[in-house]
Amino acid sequence: QGGTRSPRCDCAGDFHKKIGLFCCRGCPAGHYLKAPCTEPCGNSTCLVCPQDTFLAWENHHNSECARCQACDEQASQVALENCSAVADTRCGCKPGWFVECQVSQCVSSSPFYCQPCLDCGALHRHTRLLCSRRDTDCGTCLPGFYEHGDGCVSCPTSTLGSCPERCAAVCGWRQMF
């Protein structure tokens, strides 16, 4: 609890607020108010947030800490940063997965689920933009493959297969009969 920080304190200021009878110094981040100060401009009795709870800011009135959020396993979320006394758990997606927001106006606190990133290699395409905040952006077909419909088709390995115009341009030879 301690003594007086400063003999002249302003109850309307940032550091001291009226709590109960007196103008008290608040609790630092990561601490909750156990009891208000017992003298003018004194220090409140503050205790560290218990495990799995936190308070991110200096506060004057919080008599309990907020419960740390649990990452939603059903939505394939993982903890990127574990909860501490001063910060909530930061949930996100594991490498190879991206955040798919569940609401149209997406902000940092919006509910989300994790989707596996497209594997451009498996689609025989170049990776244009690596997957992180959104899905992988795949580019043109890899060498030895040509565009056919929505996918990439392997260049024929023999003269028996047909090789349309796009194939010929990429694979370097014309269809043979």
Partner: antibody
Amino acid sequence: QVQLQQSGGGLVQAGGSLRLSCAASGFTFTSYAMSWVRQAPGKGLEWVATISDGDSYSYFPDSVKDRFIISRDNAKNSLFLQMNSLRAEDTAVYYCARDRIYGSVQYYAMDYWGRGTLVTVSS
Amino acid sequence: EIVLTQSPATLSLSPGERATLSCRASESVEFSGTSLMQWYQQKPGQAPRLLIYAASNVESGIPARFSGSGSGTDFTLTISSLEPEDFAVYYCQQSRKLPYTFGQGTKLEIK
């Protein structure tokens, strides 16, 4: 005029409980902290409890902490003292008092008092 | 806690005389230039009555013969000319910090 009407005193066995009441009138009850002070027979005054005005935080000396509860009902302009696990040494006249705050110093003085109610704890 | 010691325990005087009652605190009750000390009067069978607040301010309705002085740890209640109704017990009380504490009282009796 300011009035503090007390009730609830009486004889109680050691280990028992009692609830004192103080009905306030003649002032804006919600604007004042309120206190209880006791006086053992033939002895001096002892502060027992205080409750703040707006946020109703409560304060006690070590002698009654964890045994006594101070509360207020702002809608009914009433102050209460719930006394549990009573001991022979709790025998006293109990006074409720209004705490007036002075200036910007957050400084209080008990400017109006009830007439008192006698609590006798028999062992 | 702040301990308040009053002296004398009993003061025997006659009406018309000057009474000087003392209260000493175990630590300073000063805050921001104000001494957080009160004086109360209590008559037999009655509740205490506030006489002086902030060491030297006379509560409204209290006769002018009552005055308070002092700062830091040493305080005095003075009654300039005693009236018959002034014979009672007087208590000092500090509001500097919790727990609030009272002196043990000075009994002012008729000589």
